[in-house]
């Protein structure tokens, strides 16, 4: 079993200054942790490259919202 | 850390309406996916609705679509649930939750989570 006390943290130090395309993106996943300087998200786009995103940027909710959506499947 | 604080619940009877809030502090509101559950006794929790970050999307379970809306105060950091019609099958512990992973009604997305407020209906 992985330790999960002693597990690497993923942090963003520098975030993208360029807004990008909602086609060009697959999935994204919050970095929370209170180990890292910054609140962020991390994109991944569909070519598997990693982008490091501010969530205080509208661009980036909406990108959230719009990936969110996507992966809606009703189950009640 | 997001902190979330529900508020408004409490005893009404069948066909009654009530207002939760849930007040949101610490990091971006505005950032978060927020989603009301509830937990029953003796039941496991389950999905209520769903509001985007932009509060443009809202989605419900089929058991309050139509007599629950969901609703978000950016500026205020707040969210809430409308809830109309009201059932003795309503009666539940509801919780407020910020979604922060990729997802949309799935308990599991959400990170962080409010106390609960109960909500008691009488037939």
């Known amino acids: 079993q992985p330790d999960a006390i002693n597990a690497p943290v993923t942090c963003c130090y520098n975030f993208t200054n360029r807004k990008i395309s909602v086609q060009r993106l697959a999935s994204y996943r919050r970095i929370t942790s209170s180990k890292c300087p910054k609140e962020a998200v991390i994109f991944k786009t569909i070519v598997a490259k990693e982008i490091c995103a501010d969530p205080k940027q509208k661009w980036v909710q909406d990108s959230m919202d719009h990936l969110d959506k996507q992966t809606q499947t009703p189950k009640t | 850390e997001v902190q979330l604080v529900e508020s408004g619940g409490g005893l009404v009877q069948a066909g009654g309406s009530l207002r939760l809030s849930c007040a949101a502090s610490?990091?971006?509101?505005?950032?978060?996916?927020m989603g009301w559950f509830r937990q029953a006794p003796e039941k496991e929790r389950e999905f209520v609705a769903v509001?985007?970050?932009?509060?443009?999307?809202?989605f419900y379970s089929n058991s309050v679509k139509g007599r629950f809306t969901i609703s978000r105060d950016n500026a205020k950091n707040t969210v809430y649930l409308q809830m109309n019609s009201l059932k003795p099958e309503d009666t539940a512990v509801y919780y407020c939750?910020?979604?922060?992973?990729?997802?949309?009604?799935?308990?599991?997305?959400?990170?962080?989570w409010g106390q609960g407020t109960q909500v008691t209906v009488s037939s």
């Open positions: 610490g990091r971006t509101f505005s950032s978060y996916r």
């Open positions: 509001i985007s970050r932009s509060g443009g999307s809202t």
């Open positions: 939750a910020a979604g922060a992973q990729m997802g949309w009604a799935e308990a599991s997305t959400y990170d962080y």
